[in-house]
Amino acid sequence: MHSDCIFKKEQAMCLEKIQRANELMGFNDSSPGCPGMWDNITCWKPAHVGEMVLVSCPELFRIFNPDQVWETETIGESDFGDSNSLDLSDMGVVSRNCTEDGWSEPFPHYFDACGFDEYESETGDQDYYYLS
């Protein structure tokens, strides 16, 4: 499947997941905490202040690094999966903290967490991963 299609599908699934999570957690626009979001790279579930959310490396990096193998499991498609099974010390895990001021930036940043072979990428199709 072309990357454009992958990401449109991922985004649509993300918005559905967020809606379900909001209902389960009793979240609404006036709730304290951090709303679920699609950051154009991956999906982040809603969270309470003080909560750290962990996700596996997104699909984008399976396109960037097709040979990369991560030890962590992929977040389930039907929901957000069990983030308790993920550990920040694992390669392939990214976190965001929900603070009083909103979401922190990813830690580590995606490239550091998910790996990126810069040399290998030089030979790749430079338009392959445009998300438009």
């Epitope: 154009n40 960037f64 603070t99 930036e105 995606y110 490239f111 030089e122 430079q126 991963y129």
Partner: antibody, heavy 120, light 107 residues
């Protein structure tokens, strides 16, 4: 090797506009976030803006929000900074830097900068 | 925005001495704190990422530590080429910010 070359700086009057460019080579430009960082003469570094690899995410410092626009043309391996309503306090050496990430990241390689002087 | 404070503003030392530079954040930045070196007339150079991670090509005398709000850059034994300005930078919260810098000069 990674190379970033800024251009477009110069002397401009307050209230006018200027567009800076940054030509990138030596890496796959379209996979990296890019930053603009500035440095007023004899002062420290000030982060200005960042744009994600595909241009879908753009973030700005409060001091430039609403006046500056960051953009990129991945087909030309070029980063831009459109600066409108320039003020004397915008006088600085403007650096473009590669962000080591798709979304934002920290600057890991820097250009040599282009000087913008806002003066009447 | 997160404000980074660096101390001291200037550090006067001799070659061979140990330099200890501090960076304090107004709110926790976890470990998303990076250190840069800038020499006169040159662009900044990334020295340390994520508070303590070393980078290839950077001499082993440079090391970093800390997390949350308090961070330290240590130069174990100053070489003549190390006299420069050092900046910390946080990439934990937008807008990103830099500290005001610490100038390490020759005593």
């Amino acid at each position: 090797q990674v190379q970033l070359v800024e251009s477009g700086g110069g002397v401009v009057q307050p209230g006018r506009s200027l567009r800076l460019s940054c030509a990138a080579s030596g890496f796959t430009f379209s996979r990296f976030a890019m930053h603009w960082v500035r440095q007023a003469p004899g002062k420290g570094l000030e982060w200005v803006a960042v744009i994600s690899f595909d241009g879908g995410n753009k973030y700005y410092a409060e001091s430039v929000k609403g006046r500056f626009t960051i953009s990129r043309d991945n087909s030309k391996n070029t980063l831009y900074l459109q600066m409108n309503s320039l003020r004397a306090e915008d006088t600085a050496l403007f650096y473009c830097a590669r962000g080591y990430d798709v979304l934002t990241g920290y600057p890991d390689y820097w250009g040599q900068g282009t000087l913008v002087t806002v003066s009447s | 925005e997160i404000v980074l404070t660096q101390s001291p503003a200037t550090l006067s030392l001799s070659p061979g001495e140990r330099a200890t530079l501090s960076c304090r954040a107004s709110k926790s930045v976890g470990r998303s704190l990076h250190w840069y070196q800038q020499k006169p007339g040159q662009a900044p150079r990334l020295l340390i990422k994520y508070a303590s991670q070393s980078l290839s090509g950077i001499p082993a005398r440079f090391s970093g530590s800390g997390s949350g709000t308090d961070f330290t850059l240590t130069i174990s034994s100053l070489e003549p080429e190390d006299f420069a300005v050092y900046y910390c930078h946080q990439s934990s919260r937008l807008p990103f910010t830099f500290g005001p810098g610490t100038k390490v000069d020759i005593k």
